[in-house]
Interface confidence: medium
Amino acid sequence: SSPTSSASSFSSSAPFLASAVSAQPPLPDQCPALCECSEAARTVKCVNRNLTEVPTDLPAYVRNLFLTGNQLAVLPAGAFARRPPLAELAALNLSGSRLDEVRAGAFEHLPSLRQLDLSHNPLADLSPFAFSGSNASVSAPSPLVELILNHIVPPEDERQNRSFEGMVVAALLAGRALQGLRRLELASNHFLYLPRDVLAQLPSLRHLDLSNNSLVSLTYVSFRNLTHLESLHLEDNALKVLHNGTLAELQGLPHIRVFLDNNPWVCDCHMADMVTWLKETEVVQGKDRLTCAYPEKMRNRVLLELNSADLDCDPILPPSLQTS
């Protein structure tokens, strides 16, 4: 079935259409079984079709590929490698396709791939070389500019015997391939901590979304190298306080906007520096919405309205006077 000339309409292939030999250029009017294609829009949509594999007979013109809502389970090495390569493919959306394993080199031979969305897949096994494609200490730079990895944490019983945070960070840092990454979204992944070296090795980041995780502290995280960072989303975490070092680093970033809503701020004597900083800074968006969660007597108090007299700590009793 021929692609239509209208960018808004798509041609559908008949189910079980015989596919072209993968070594030969796809036919100009080819559209994979169970997909919709628009050559005018340079777009292929294979959405909610329970596909278990990435079609090999994708048209060479594809620039935007949607493979959402399928049952892919695994992306093997070279899952998108074609001869000739899919040289135009710039945006690839694989969200919600039940992927639990992404293997080394899964995105190799996609020279123009700038946006990749793997969100809402339970990635129990993300190869360290999923994005770099090679186990060299320094890989060829990836063309990726946006990497969307929201809600990729697998259920507890499906996780490997290793840190999920560590697995994700290993893939982000392997071979220094993602030096050009500008947007990284890691929301809703139950992250308990952010490994200290991750941000230092992603110097081009403009947007970082860590919202809806379980981050308790940023003490060991350095934002100093992220001189281009424009937005930092830390809403809906478990942050208790931001310490001086973090405050100074954030204040030193020239273009930054920070989002801190819905964290369980502990309004005791350790909060004094942060309150002072909040009153002065322009970088925190919606700072007037930030409220205390603890201690009980401070619950729901607005941070900006606190003064030093409000922020006290219970005296630490000598061991002899402590009770169990």
Epitope: A18, V21, P32, E53, P55, T56, A73, V74, G78, R103
Partner: antibody
């Protein structure tokens, strides 16, 4: 009983063509990937080609790309291998073998008895 | 491409012997490894999959182990029916077989 039966082998001259067939029975053919594997005389096993259950996913070993074409007819429970521009080094027993549901995430758990292809002048 | 290297190429053993065949992958394949048995003039038969899982109907004297790049097939007590050629196969990226190990009578 799960069964795969190959046919279509024979003697052919270099540059010639053959079409191999594999008839499947005893399982839901349309839900499994299928493969061709070959074994040259006195040699080991070599995977040749893979086809996904809907025919949208096809892979070949480099040495046959552009010469061999794998296909399937789910209505007939049949797998095919069209072999063109045959070379001496294509001489082998060709086995049809069943894979899994997706990609190469499953070993080859059912094999046919094989059909012999001899390329010789 | 992933290469698979088996050793030894030939193994002479007697009935009752414990036999071990090794297979090495050129890069990590996790546990995506299978073992096959082939007798002359016959098709290969699947013995082990996912490195250590025994295929239904295969005698328990066959076992597999390993992960990453190093794998082992063990026959705990060699039986007369076990003299054959054994192949390992990775299925992490496409399919690749080892060159085979022939187990012959000593």
């Amino acid at each position: 009983e799960v069964q795969l039966v190959e046919s279509g082998g024979g003697l052919v001259q270099p540059g010639g063509s053959l079409r191999l067939s594999c008839a499947a029975s005893g399982f839901t053919f349309s839900s499994r990937s299928m493969n061709w594997v070959r074994q040259a005389p006195g040699r080991g096993l070599e995977w040749v080609s893979y086809i996904g259950f809907s025919s949208s996913t096809i892979y070949y070993v480099d040495s046959v790309k552009g010469r061999f074409t794998i296909s399937r007819d789910n209505a007939k429970n049949s797998l095919y291998l069209q072999m063109n521009t045959l070379r001496d080094e294509d001489t082998a027993v060709y086995y049809c073998a069943r894979g899994g549901v997706r990609y190469f995430d499953h070993p080859l758990d059912v094999w046919g008895k094989g059909t012999t292809v001899t390329v010789s002048s | 491409d992933i290469q698979m290297t088996q050793s030894p190429s030939t193994l002479s053993a007697s009935v009752g012997d414990r036999v071990t065949i090794t297979c090495r992958a050129s890069q990590s394949i996790s546990s995506w490894l299978a073992w096959y048995q082939q007798k002359p003039g016959k098709a290969p038969k699947l013995l082990i999959y996912k490195a250590s899982s025994l295929e239904s109907g295969v005698p328990s004297r066959f076992s597999g182990s390993g992960s990453g790049t190093q794998f082992t097939l063990t026959i705990s007590s060699l039986q007369p029916d076990d003299f054959a050629t054994y192949y390992c196969q990775q299925y992490y990226s496409y399919y690749t077989f080892g060159q085979g190990t022939k187990v012959e009578i000593k």
